[in-house]
């Protein structure tokens, strides 16, 4: 299950992937010295009856339907870390693996 | 972060896990040998802003607020197999490890 | 603790159809967690797997008996029996009950613990 | 089905010998394996489950080892009420098999 790619052009309702690139500078978070801008992704889209479904699990509550279950929702399913430079709380500068990212697959969960 | 947990008599409206039991037998699925039933657990509640975030990403999407992004939802975040004796699609039956089929905790995502 | 006791006669004339019944006590035979089955065992050979079965009914045979083979439940008496059809003398085995589960703590299948003390079954005539 | 061949099939060995029983798969069966000891006019008694986990109330002497097709139990000191057949059991696919057995002497 590969999850599906889009962009602003596509006519696409159903969960996707699209392309966002983060710029740190525009946040105004000058403690991050590398990179100051990367391309995150993001998901967004419909979740209809068993699209896309990463976990059997999400098709079991939708057939369970408990009380206060929202449904499916079109989040990552696949995410990847990033080296980043930036200062720590202590002001000392860190090189260091951030995981948690960048979304390589969206699905619904 | 260990995520919430909550119960039908809980007043929490973020972000939590709710107990769920599945049972196989009242969905009629007769290809399912054991269990007959089994604690799934599900993920409900309000994600509001940097509530339970498992991802970086997560916030940031929320930071660049791009066209489409419906903000974080409740979703499992951690989640576990179980072990399930099954008949498969050539009528064996199997003894196999079923990943995602257990919530052990939610988050916004 | 669960406990199985096997009652059945042990001499069956060939052709003819092998009743066992397997009694349980210390637990329920409707526990959702637990199975039923049947095995045996040939003089001098072997464990074969005869079948197993849950409390609704559902049931799950050896192919290689199946054409002869039932395997019922009576939650009333708690008790689950064996009939095997047209028997000869290659039926001729000790036959044992024994409880499958479901650990739904670990999500772990659990077979054949315990066991009946076990029927010495005689084909002849 | 799958078949389950034992070796040795019969096995002499004295008290405090450290002792191995194979279990060889047709094909390859994961971990789902358990190991059984029978004494005569007795019902098995289970001693290992999915091919390495010690049954509860097994003395920790036996151990089970192996996954795919080849697996083992190893007795690290024998004593004398171990002396009995012991038998495997894959419950991967059905029909589930056992194992012919091996028979455990005392020399």
């Known amino acids: 299950n590969l999850g599906l790619d889009c962009d602003e052009h596509s006519s696409e309702s159903r969960c996707c992937r699209y392309p966002l690139t983060v710029d740190f500078e525009a946040f105004g978070w000058d403690w991050i010295i590398a990179p100051k801008r990367y391309k995150a992704n993001y998901c967004s889209g419909q979740c209809e009856y068993m699209f896309m479904q990463k976990y059997p699990h999400t098709h079991l509550v939708q057939q369970a339907n408990p009380r206060g279950s929202a449904g499916p929702c079109c989040t990552p399913t696949k995410m990847s870390p990033i080296n980043m430079l930036y200062f720590n709380d202590k002001q000392q500068i860190i090189y260091g693996k951030i995981p948690g990212m960048v979304v390589d697959r969206c699905g619904c969960s | 972060n260990l995520g919430l947990d909550c119960d039908e008599h809980s007043s929490e409206s973020r972000c939590c896990r709710y107990p769920l039991t599945v049972d196989f037998e009242a969905f009629g699925w007769d290809w399912i040998i054991a269990p007959k039933r089994y604690k799934a657990n599900y993920c409900s509640g309000q994600c509001e802003y940097m509530f339970m975030q498992k991802y970086p990403h997560t916030h940031l999407v929320q930071q660049a607020n791009p066209r489409g992004s419906a903000g974080p939802c409740c979703t499992p975040t951690k989640m576990s197999p179980i072990n399930m004796l099954y008949f498969n699609d050539k009528q064996q039956i199997i003894y196999g490890k079923i990943p995602g089929m257990v919530v052990d905790r939610c988050g916004c995502s | 603790q669960v406990q199985l006791v096997q009652s059945g006669p042990g001499l069956v004339k060939p052709s003819e159809t092998l009743s066992l019944t397997c009694t349980v006590s210390?637990?329920?035979?409707?526990?959702?967690?637990?199975?039923w089955g049947w095995i045996r065992q040939p003089p001098g050979k072997g464990l074969e797997w005869i079948g197993t079965?849950?409390?609704?009914?559902?049931?799950y045979y050896n192919p290689s008996l199946k054409s002869r083979v039932t395997i019922s439940v009576d939650t009333s008496k708690n008790q689950f029996s064996l009939k095997l059809s047209s028997v000869t003398a290659a039926d001729t085995a000790v036959y044992y009950c024994?409880?499958?589960?479901?650990?739904?703590?670990?999500?772990?299948?659990?077979?054949?613990?315990?066991w009946g003390q076990g029927t010495t079954v005689t084909v002849s005539s | 089905d799958i078949q389950l061949t034992q070796s040795p099939s019969s096995l002499s060995a004295s008290v405090g010998d450290r002792v191995t029983i194979t279990c060889r798969a047709s094909?390859?069966?994961?971990?789902?394996l358990g190991w059984y000891q029978q004494k005569p006019g007795k019902a098995p008694k289970r001693l290992i489950y999915?091919?390495?986990s010690l049954q509860s109330g097994v003395p920790s002497r036996f151990s089970g080892s192996g996954s795919g097709t080849e697996f083992s139990l190893t007795l690290s000191s024998l004593q004398p009420e171990d002396f009995a057949t012991y038998f495997c059991?894959?419950?991967?696919?059905?029909?589930?098999?056992f194992g012919q057995g091996t028979k455990l002497e005392i020399k």
């Open positions: 024994a409880r499958d589960y479901y650990d739904s703590s670990g999500y772990y299948y659990n077979w054949f613990d315990p």
């Open positions: 210390g637990g329920s035979i409707s526990n959702s967690n637990y199975y």
């Open positions: 079965t849950y409390y609704s009914g559902t049931t």
């Open positions: 094909q390859d069966i994961r971990n789902d």
């Open positions: 999915a091919a390495s």
């Open positions: 059991l894959q419950h991967h696919i059905y029909p589930w098999t």
